[in-house]
């Protein structure tokens, strides 16, 4: 069997809402992702599971089943979102993200992801990981491809 | 539906002060901030500051400190700009601006007038 | 603070026409981080007061038709209206959401011939 290569695009939109009582902050953050079937028959993508995290904690997870399959020599581009919470002990960025005296208020992420898919009763697994600047001050939307290389760092392998 | 009621035009003399007032509703007034824009006559527009609702926290443009002081009152959903030492170079309209946060401007009020003339 | 330059200064176009204004800033509305440019579009009737058109330098408004479109990055930022209809006879603003002080251009007019 040939590869079947999966490519983190990068964030598609993240919406931002608070609250101020819990000094919490939500992130709905969608991701774009090609899948690439390089081989001559047909294959499942069986799920999708995803997780982000900020400083080390996983503010984030989801979770796709029963996906698409993707035909031979064909890729296919995949949505997924993850709703994302920053709160109690990190419940000090709230001041960060709202404060009223800048208008960019970045944060670093990391997104990974895990693809699932499955050919003639075969399983196979692949990763990606990638660190992705946020604002997380204010809702951002992008045309296709237009964060494809936000990435700040790989991490090390 | 959000509004941003604004106060009646007015006209004051030089040396005057003034307030003006931008009733919210429609949403949760301290849920957003509120933007004050100048609007001179047939000239461009001037950010002059924001405060939060929810903490009274404000930013000024530099150029409007001293002139300009932006405050709230919670229970009536009222944001209010007060303008001190008016001259002739303060008649414009003036705009509140709502944003959720450090979004964009999303709606404006239908503008209050200042005339000063003596 | 950014200064924000618009050109032309007015426009006198005919019902149907594809219209393009430019706004340019002094210093770049980009977030290097998450490689979104900060500028917005606001469009003002006679009479009204403004009323947002376009976010993000590209991100139509809700509502905004699709005759609307932003482009551009970093300095440099054009708004086209691919056919001028009646209504959009008003001033374009383009506006620095970058940082503080937030900033305006001086406008661009478009009138009917």
């Known amino acids: 069997p040939r590869s079947i290569d999966v490519k983190y695009i990068g964030v598609k939109s993240a919406y931002v809402s608070y609250d101020v009582q819990k000094r919490t902050i939500y992130l709905n953050i969608t991701n774009t992702l090609n899948i690439t079937n390089n081989n001559y028959y047909s294959v499942e993508v069986e799920n999708i599971t995803a997780q982000v995290q900020f400083a080390k904690t996983v503010i984030g997870k989801a979770r796709l089943n029963n996906i698409t399959h993707i035909g031979p020599l064909d890729m296919k581009q995949i949505d997924y979102t993850v709703p994302t919470v920053i709160a109690e002990e990190m419940s000090y960025m709230y001041d960060f993200c709202t404060l009223i005296s800048i208008k960019v208020h970045n944060i670093v992420l990391m997104m990974q992801v895990t693809v699932t898919t499955t050919y003639f009763g075969h399983s196979e697994q692949i990763s990606q990981e990638r660190y992705q600047y946020v604002d997380c001050g204010r809702n951002t939307t992008y045309q296709l491809g237009q964060s494809e290389y936000l990435n700040v760092l790989q991490p090390q392998q | 539906e959000v509004q941003l009621q604004q106060s009646g035009p007015v006209l004051v003399k030089p040396g005057a002060s003034v307030k003006m007032s931008c009733k919210a509703s429609g949403y949760t007034f301290t849920d957003y901030y509120i933007h004050w824009v100048k609007q001179s006559h047939g000239r461009s527009l001037e950010w002059i500051g924001v405060i939060s609702p929810y903490n009274d926290n404000t930013n000024y443009n530099q150029k409007f400190k001293g002139k300009a002081t932006l405050t709230v009152d919670k229970s009536s959903s009222t944001a209010y700009m007060e303008l001190n030492s008016l001259t002739s170079e303060d008649s414009a309209v003036y705009y509140c601006?709502?944003?959720?946060?450090?979004?964009?401007?999303?709606?404006w009020g239908q503008g209050t007038t200042l005339t000063v003339s003596s | 603070d950014i200064v924000m330059t618009q050109s032309p200064s007015s426009l006198s176009v005919s019902a149907g026409e594809k219209v393009t204004m430019s706004c340019k800033s002094s210093q770049s509305l980009l977030n290097s981080g998450n490689q979104k440019n900060y500028l917005a579009w606001h469009q003002q009737r006679p009479g009204q007061p403004p009323k947002l058109l376009i976010y993000g330098a590209s991100t139509r408004e809700s509502g905004v038709p699709d005759r609307f479109t932003g482009s551009g990055s970093g300095t440099e930022f054009t708004l086209t209206i691919s056919s001028v209809q009646a209504e959009d006879l008003a001033v374009y603003y383009c506006?620095?959401?970058?940082?503080?002080?937030?900033?305006f251009g001086a406008g661009t007019k478009l009138e009917l011939k």
């Open positions: 506006q620095n959401d970058h940082s503080y002080p937030l900033t």
């Open positions: 601006v709502r944003t959720y946060y450090s979004n964009y401007f999303d709606y």
